[in-house]
């Protein structure tokens, strides 16, 4: 039959950070092409990445419609040049992905310290509220707007001259910490969703230190 050399996709894997979501799979195609379908548990299948030779498909546009829904994808394999061909059961070979719930599973991207400002013995540290690809009323929502209070940030800070780290946490994107006058401090932040069971934490942000351009000092 026309499907003799067609193999089903395998190792279907969701790769998602801040809701940018790509489905990846194997194998690299030899004389075959792929089409991906995605649906919610209760919805209809929607086809994406038609007859592609890629082994990935960007499904962001679909999952951002409702990030709290649970999605399932499947990858169909077709013989190259004969995409009408079906398998022995009368339909093309396909493989299902694991279920994926973006709100609960998307990785938290590496945060960025937007600014820090010293006033006397206090430093205000602000974390950049990164835009996601989730849309509402035509505008892209920030990470905070999507996750609300489910998202907290942890600040790690230490004197430039020592290695002993202190921490602070916040339900917003701002910290206000006490520092010793005349000392320079370094900062790093991490995004955390404490209520999650997987992918709870981001990687740490790049370290920013006082005495560099990003900060501001006021007596």
């Amino acid at each position: 039959s026309g499907t003799t050399n067609t193999v089903a996709a395998y190792n279907l894997t969701w790769k998602s950070t801040n809701f940018k979501t790509i489905l990846e799979w194997e194998p690299k195609p030899v004389n075959q092409v792929y089409t991906v379908q995605i649906s919610t548990k209760s919805g209809d299948w929607k086809s994406k990445c038609f007859y592609t030779t890629d082994t990935e498909c960007d499904l962001t546009d679909e999952i951002v419609k409702d990030v709290k829904q649970t999605y399932l994808a499947r990858v169909f394999s077709y013989p190259a040049g004969n995409v009408e061909s079906t398998g022995s059961a009368g339909e093309p070979l396909y493989e299902n992905s694991p279920e994926f719930t973006p709100y609960l599973e998307t990785n938290l991207g590496q945060p960025t310290i937007q600014s820090f400002e010293q006033v006397g013995t206090k430093v205000n540290v602000t974390v950049e509220d990164e835009r996601t690809l989730v849309r509402k009323n035509g505008t892209f929502l920030t990470l905070r707007q999507v996750f609300g209070k489910d998202l907290i940030y942890t600040l790690y800070y230490w004197k430039s001259s020592s290695s002993g780290k202190k921490t602070a946490k916040t339900n917003t994107n701002e910290f206000l910490i006490d520092v010793d006058k005349g000392e320079n401090y370094c900062f790093s932040v991490q995004a955390v969703i404490p209520s999650r069971t997987v992918n709870r934490k981001s990687t740490d942000s790049p370290v920013e230190c006082m005495g560099q351009e990003k900060g501001e000092f006021r007596e």
């Epitope: 999507v146 489910d150 006490d178």
Partner: antibody, heavy 125, light 108 residues
């Protein structure tokens, strides 16, 4: 200063949907606070129902989640509560409240610092 | 869910006396997420203490909060006539946010 005012029917029939609106005056609903609904059964303690951010991000009490919808209308400076399939057990005083960030120990945490006066809802046929 | 148990249920005291109210959590609560409210009959609750120990705006310094982990305390150093009310503790760290059952402070 910010004031909150609940409005909606005081009497709802069993199995119907309870609908309440909270109007925010003296400030913008989009100003970085969260907006909550809390209820108090007659002579009893307080029960948190859920909250919403101006962006529409919500959190609900799991015990009510299947029946509750909280929504926000930034153009009207209002947020609303819908509670479906009500029974006599939903008879209570319903409060709306503002959840605003307070500084504590290096960070900011949200507390319910402004409340509406409350509206009594009775579920009865 | 985190259950908050308040004791005593009722506290009968005279004006000028000291009131000590307890709130015990079924599991550890970060101090950052613990609040106390006062409620008078026919009125909405009023935020007194946040972060377990910080007074909200306009709250007299006779009100103080303390504690950590699972045990928290609200103290009213000298009761004024307007302090007779019901007091609730609340945790806002874990959904669902929960309130204690309340302690009624009544005039003896």
């Amino acid at each position: 200063q910010v004031q909150l005012q609940e409005s909606g029917p005081g009497l709802v029939k069993p199995s119907q949907t309870l609908s309440l609106t909270c109007t925010v005056s003296g400030g913008s609903i989009s100003s970085g606070q969260y907006w909550s609904w809390i209820r108090q059964h007659p002579g009893k303690g307080l029960e948190w129902i859920g909250e919403i951010y101006y962006s529409g991000s919500t959190r609900y009490n799991p015990s009510l989640k299947s029946r509750v919808t909280i929504s926000v209308d930034t153009s009207k400076n209002q947020f609303s509560l819908k509670l479906s399939s009500v029974t006599a057990a939903d008879t209570a005083v319903y409060y709306c409240a503002r959840d605003t960030p307070y500084y504590y120990d290096g960070g900011y945490y949200y507390y319910m610092d402004v409340w509406g006066k409350g509206t009594t809802v009775t579920v009865s046929s | 869910e985190i259950v908050l148990t308040q004791s005593p249920g009722t506290l009968s005291l005279s004006p000028g006396e000291r009131a000590t109210l307890s709130c015990r959590a079924s599991q550890s609560v970060s101090s950052s997420y613990l609040a106390w409210y006062q409620q008078k009959p026919g009125q909405a609750p009023r935020l007194l203490i946040y972060g377990a120990s910080s007074r909200a705006t306009g709250i007299p310094d006779r009100f103080s909060g303390s504690g950590s982990g699972t045990d928290f305390t609200l103290t009213i150093s000298r009761l004024e006539p307007e302090d007779f009310a019901v007091y609730y503790c609340q945790q806002v760290g874990v959904v669902p946010y929960t309130f204690g059952g309340g302690t009624k402070v009544e005039i003896k």
